[in-house]
Amino acid sequence: APRGTQAEESPFVGNPGNITGARGLTGTLRCQLQVQGEPPEVHWLRDGQILELADSTQTQVPLGEDEQDDWIVVSQLRITSLQLSDTGQYQCLVFLGHQTFVSQPGYVGLEGLPYFLEEPEDRTVAANTPFNLSCQAQGPPEPVDLLWLQDAVPLATAPGHGPQRSLHVPGLNKTSSFSCEAHNAKGVTTSRTATITVLPQQPRNLHLVSRQPTELEVAWTPGLSGIYPLTHCTLQAVLSDDGMGIQAGEPDPPEEPLTSQASVPPHQLRLGSLHPHTPYHIRVACTSSQGPSSWTHWLPVETPEGVPLGPPENISATRNGSQAFVHWQEPRAPLQGTLLGYRLAYQGQDTPEVLMDIGLRQEVTLELQGDGSVSNLTVCVAAYTAAGDGPWSLPVPLEAWRPGQAQPVHQLVKEPSTPAFSWPW
């Protein structure tokens, strides 16, 4: 066929129509052609590109009894739930023998109420703290103008006059609702309503007021909480774990924390039942009727040392002439700190008391003055830490040494000539 005669020879007797509608619409485009001989497969084009995954059906009706007679071929393209990506120019394409034929175009357009691409989301914010909300809508038809509403009250005089995609809120002191309206030539669509819950601000200046071996007193400054009074504050303490280390931003402690509630005011709390001479991390959050604030950062604190809670154990004292042999074991009761040593005191019936610092040894040999005839000699031992002396043991009488008894080998400790302190009994 001559190169310029294609249009006249077109087999198409029905071209696609036009569809214009709102999102979600279902519609059908239809092509009809009349051909001689075997009917061809009809392909659909959108904006000049073959649709690889077209929802199309093809019906073929013979107009005669012979296979070489004419056929009517109808192809229908179904568009389900119309979207912006479906819009464009549609045509049918067929290959007949060695020739290509394209139908006249039809158009699919989208026109309706604005469609939200982004809507404001529920969120929590600290009182008097700035934040942003987002809203985005599109047509067609364009333009789409937005109007923000706070607690159902418009924030601008007319659509398009106030903030558009992003609304900056400098801060709230009460829980509020926000929505946005999208306006175009077809009408108005309203977004979901976002609830912005106002929580107390994070407490500030968490600090230690006083320390004792088993308790810490802490205080803090509450943050603003809007129109909602604080109902209580919650303090958490956790044993510091050198292996893990609680970083300032770490969301959760490495073990189950000790939790205490404080009624407010005052913004102060005494934490008891702690271990002495132990590092802790503490944090605080305050709660109103709307919910809790965020936690403060973890604050490292430490309980101070205490004195040992019990005397040394299993004290034995034996005498052999002018020498006395004393030994003992570490207290079973908590030391409440680092053991620095032991103090030992002994006294005879009519002699002054003698106090000695033994250091960390748990046995000592005493060189008694005179011929060793001092009667009713008794010995007491106490453990001590940096915080001071623990309780003294009950007086232990010095027993005569019997052959076969073990005897510690230690340098002799000479008895000082003057008493150093008054007796604990």
Epitope: A7, D47, E52, G88, Q99, T100, V102, P105
Partner: antibody
Framework: QVQLQQPGAELVKPGASVQLSCKAS????????INWVKQRPGQGLEWMGN????????NYNEKFKSKATLTVDKSSSTAYMQLSSLTSEDSAVYFC???????????WGQGTTLTVSS | DIVMSQSPSSLAVSAGERVTMSCKSS????????????LAWYQQKPGQSPKLLIY???TRESGVPDRFTGSGSGTDFTLTISSVQAEDLAVYYC????????FGGGTKLEIK
């Protein structure tokens, strides 16, 4: 009769821009892609890009993305290619061609000879 | 991008001889939906626009002499001129339109 008409020649100075035209007739202009092809003297054919007049959708050869801009005017059934920041390397014959979906017939314009010279 | 390679780049033959030229693509040009190979052969004479000879790899364009034959499928294609005539002096280009357009570098046919 399908025709693609192009001006025979254009003379422009280096650094300037030029808009080449391709006027279509004899068929439904909005239904077929228009392609642009460059041929430097004594060289082969280089596809530059194409445009679908129905939607103004375009594709470009990466090599010509910052050099060429394709547009159409549906009311006059004319396709345009604007070439910017011209140098002597842009001196060539530029053809427009209609793509019949990989089939027959396809039609080519006669080409516009662009000379970039001061 | 699809790359098209043509060989040889030139050849000289006497009138009446048979000539074949090759075109290879970097990926298959067979569209499984339309069941067609989107490869075309063009002839360009000096000072003229390219003229379509073959499309769909093997379909001869209307008015093209039957001494021109296209063959091949997928990635390997051949243009054969069964008996070269003096007027066949030209450059021959293959072109893929499977994905946009890409031309081969051309084969220059000279007559001895």
């Amino acid at each position: 009769q399908v025709q693609l008409q192009q001006p025979g020649a254009e003379l422009v100075k280096p650094g300037a821009s030029v808009q080449l035209s391709c006027k279509a007739s004899g068929y439904t202009f909005i239904s077929f892609w228009i392609n642009w092809v460059k041929q430097r003297p004594g060289q082969g054919l280089e596809w530059m890009g194409n445009i679908f007049p129905g939607s103004s959708s375009t594709n470009y050869n990466e090599k010509f993305k910052s050099k060429a801009t394709l547009t159409v005017d549906k009311s006059s059934s004319t396709a345009y290619m604007q070439l910017s920041s011209l140098t002597s390397e842009d001196s060539a014959v530029y053809f427009c061609a209609r793509d019949y979906y990989g089939g027959s017939p396809d039609y080519w314009g006669q080409g516009t000879t662009l000379t970039v010279s001061s | 991008d699809i790359v098209m390679s043509q060989s040889p780049s030139s050849l000289a033959v006497s009138a009446g001889e048979r000539v074949t030229m090759s075109c290879k693509s970097s990926q298959s040009l067979l569209n499984t939906r339309t069941r067609k190979n989107y490869l075309a052969w063009y002839q360009q004479k000096p000072g003229q626009s390219p003229k379509l000879l073959i499309y769909w790899a093997s379909t001869r364009e209307s008015g093209v002499p039957d001494r021109f034959t296209g063959s091949g499928s997928g990635t390997d294609f051949t243009l054969t001129i069964s008996s070269v005539q003096a007027e066949d002096l030209a450059v021959y280009y293959c072109k893929q339109s499977y994905n946009l357009w890409t031309f081969g570098g051309g084969t220059k046919l000279e007559i001895k």
